[in-house]
């Protein structure tokens, strides 16, 4: 049975949060760099796998927790290692914008899970 109990954030809520933290922002988390990820390989866990390494950045904590809740709901979420580009680092804001673009596409096509 899924944990946590409280319903996971909806895709719409995730989009709203991603918009909130990227609008009018040239940078996030003091320009911290993270590994680029392939979002098609399970977008929540893939994004989390990269973003979880960002600390001391309150701006993305809510996003991290939303991704964690969504990733936690996936079957065997903790066991799947998402495909990661270990040779490419990008700024946090770029990864968040990539995620926003991808999530919006998923939302438009109605493939929420």
């Amino acid at each position: 049975s899924p944990s946590p109990v409280t319903p996971s954030p909806t895709l719409k809520e995730l989009i709203e949060e991603l918009v909130n933290i990227t609008q009018n922002q040239a940078s996030l988390c003091n320009g911290s760099m993270v590994w680029s990820v392939n979002l098609t390989a399970g977008m929540y866990c893939a994004a989390l796998e990269s973003l979880i390494n960002v600390s001391d950045c309150s701006a993305i904590q809510r996003t991290q927790r939303m991704l964690k809740a969504l990733c936690s709901q996936k079957p065997a979420a903790g066991q799947i290692s998402s495909e990661r580009s270990r040779d490419t680092k990008i700024e946090v804001i770029q990864l968040v914008k990539n995620l926003l673009t991808y999530v919006r596409g998923v939302y438009r096509h109605g493939n929420f899970r």
Partner: antibody, heavy 119, light 107 residues
């Protein structure tokens, strides 16, 4: 600096309920969630859940879904945990905490509130 | 839920020794493990986050390592004030879960 001050010890009867408070200071209350953790008889720690004061959103550990309700009062920068249908198994020390540096890693803790359930 | 196993409930040590406390996760938690120290009657104190990052003010004889499923907290040059309970936490997945704890005591 970040401080969390919890309410005092409670002695309650089985079946009763109790409300534990956690008053925060030293940071912007809506910036970080308040986490609640239980420790029974000096044993290990169990995560109960968290509440995000920014929007009131909560996430609970399934084991506590019928046991705890988390709320906040933004005006006083205080978080509350309401425990209900208490049994002797719920006798424990309950902690509130915040995570500032790393998401979900609680580095600032209240002093703990002892709840004893006894007839 | 992810289970964290701290196989040694007690560990005996002497002042000046080096000791390694282990924590094994039931599934891959990447590097999302933290370590806490707790002394009797006190609240837990966070030592390490994301497997190897020390919190400000934590002495550098505390070192965290590991990734995936196997994690270690190493205390080199153990001091008497290090005698305490140590808990690991996984913060990869909800619900957050703790290990059962390892009590570090004097031989």
């Amino acid at each position: 600096q970040v401080q969390l001050k919890q309410s005092g010890p409670e002695l309650v009867k089985p079946g009763a309920s109790v409300k534990v408070s956690c008053k925060t200071s030293g940071y912007s209350f809506t910036d970080y969630p308040i986490y609640w953790v239980r420790q029974s008889h000096g044993e290990s720690l169990e995560w109960i859940g968290y509440i995000d004061p920014y929007n009131g959103g909560t996430t609970y550990n399934q084991n506590f879904k019928d046991k705890a309700t988390l709320t906040v009062d933004k005006s006083s920068s205080t978080a509350f945990m309401h425990l209900y249908s208490l049994t002797s198994e719920d006798s424990a020390v309950y902690f509130c905490a915040t995570a500032v540096v790393a998401t979900d890693v609680m580095e600032n803790w209240g002093q703990g509130t002892s709840v004893t359930v006894s007839s | 839920d992810i289970v964290l196993t701290q196989s040694q409930k007690f560990m005996s040590t002497s002042v000046g020794d080096r000791v390694s406390i282990t924590c094994k996760a039931s599934q891959n938690v990447r590097n999302a493990v933290a370590w806490f120290q707790q002394k009797p009657g006190q609240s837990p104190k966070a030592l390490i986050y994301l497997a190897s990052n020390r919190y400000t003010g934590v002495p550098d004889h505390f070192t965290g390592s590991g990734s995936g499923t196997d994690f270690t907290l190493t205390i080199s040059n153990v001091q008497s004030e290090d005698l305490a309970d140590y808990f690991c936490l996984q913060h990869w997945n909800y619900p957050l879960t703790f290990g059962a704890g390892t009590k570090l005591e004097l031989k």
